[in-house]
């Protein structure tokens, strides 16, 4: 297993509709054809997997049907979007990238993006 640098923004504020987007960029040492991206959430010293997708370079990311994540790839960048977020989902979202094929296997873990989510205050409700 070889180490790889992964960069992601330090802070992102979710929209009033509970959507947060950020870019996860990795420094690919070679020409990977198969990449796996995993989003982890760290809060209260617990780490949980939020979503994961494997994609072939040049193709779309495919998350599971019931995933709260969507994404697109462009070169060594992955644009990730997480939906359905509310205040209790505030936390550090860590991007983990694995170059699966061809060998050698590379692993990179970002420092995390702190996503802040604010629940709407009581007001005549529109679609938050």
């Amino acid at each position: 297993c070889k180490a790889m640098h992964v960069a992601q923004p330090a802070v992102v504020l979710a929209s009033s509709r509970g959507i947060a987007s950020f870019v996860c960029e990795y420094a690919s040492p070679g020409k990977a054809t198969e990449v796996r991206v995993t989003v982890l959430r760290q809060a209260d010293s617990q780490v949980t997997e939020v979503c994961a997708a494997t994609y072939m370079m040049g193709n779309e990311l495919t998350f599971l049907d019931d995933s709260i994540c969507t994404g697109t790839s462009s070169g060594n960048q992955v644009n990730l979007t997480i939906q359905g977020l509310r205040a209790m989902d505030t936390g550090l979202y860590i991007c983990k990238v694995e170059l699966m094929y061809p060998p050698p296997y590379y692993l990179g873990i970002g420092n995390g993006t702190q996503i802040y989510v604010i629940d709407p205050e009581p007001c005549p409700d529109s679609d938050f």
């Epitope: 959430r41 049907d65 019931d66 977020l85 509310r86 209790m88 409700d125």
Partner: antibody, heavy 123, light 107 residues
Framework: QVQLVQSGAEVKKPGASVKVSCKSS????????MHWVRQAPGQGLEWMGI????????TYAQKFQGRVTMTRDTSTSTVYMELSVLRSEDTAVYYC????????????????WGQGTLVTVSS | DIQLTQSPSSLSASVGDRVTITCRVS??????LNWYRQKPGEIPKLLIY???SLQSGVPSRFSGSGSGTDFTLTITSLQPEDLATYYC?????????FGQGTKLEIK
Amino acid sequence: QVQLVQSGAEVKKPGASVKVSCKSSGYTFTSYYMHWVRQAPGQGLEWMGIINPSSGGSTYAQKFQGRVTMTRDTSTSTVYMELSVLRSEDTAVYYCARDPPITMVRGAPFDYWGQGTLVTVSS
Amino acid sequence: DIQLTQSPSSLSASVGDRVTITCRVSQDISRLLNWYRQKPGEIPKLLIYRASSLQSGVPSRFSGSGSGTDFTLTITSLQPEDLATYYCQRTYSAPYTFGQGTKLEIK
């Protein structure tokens, strides 16, 4: 095991207020949102509002804005729903239901409901 | 305000039948939709969340599909205990509106 236990049935006169409680047990109270949903006799489900027991913040359906107040007491793991200026159309069964944050592992929304509280508004 | 419209409002089917209930939403909600079953005199029970995830303990004859504005609840082999009213609901963002319900009767 998870339980949401609501207060007993109430009979109120038009113009009065009612306060219904929902006591939680078997899970971390402040880790789940709580909703209030009502159902008039023979009618469908109607969402009233949501409260974050951790912060106390709440959001209400437009229909109930100005008439409903949702509060919580973290010391007793209880949420309250107060509806004021009652009218006959408010006669319904009122339910509380819990809702985890979307990133909670194996968390499903509205997975546990209280048994319901019948509120009758009659002169 | 967001609107959820279920169809049909009521239907009658026989034991063993395949039943489909649809829910149309007035705006794109991605996959953030729940389905419930409420038997007469009982509290609502969650069947499906996030459009297609089967809630723990719910029989596999129930399935959900759809995304955006059009969603479907399917019961592959209707059972007598499925006599109930079924509701869809938008979730994870206020207002958490319910559909008007679909009353399912057993022939």
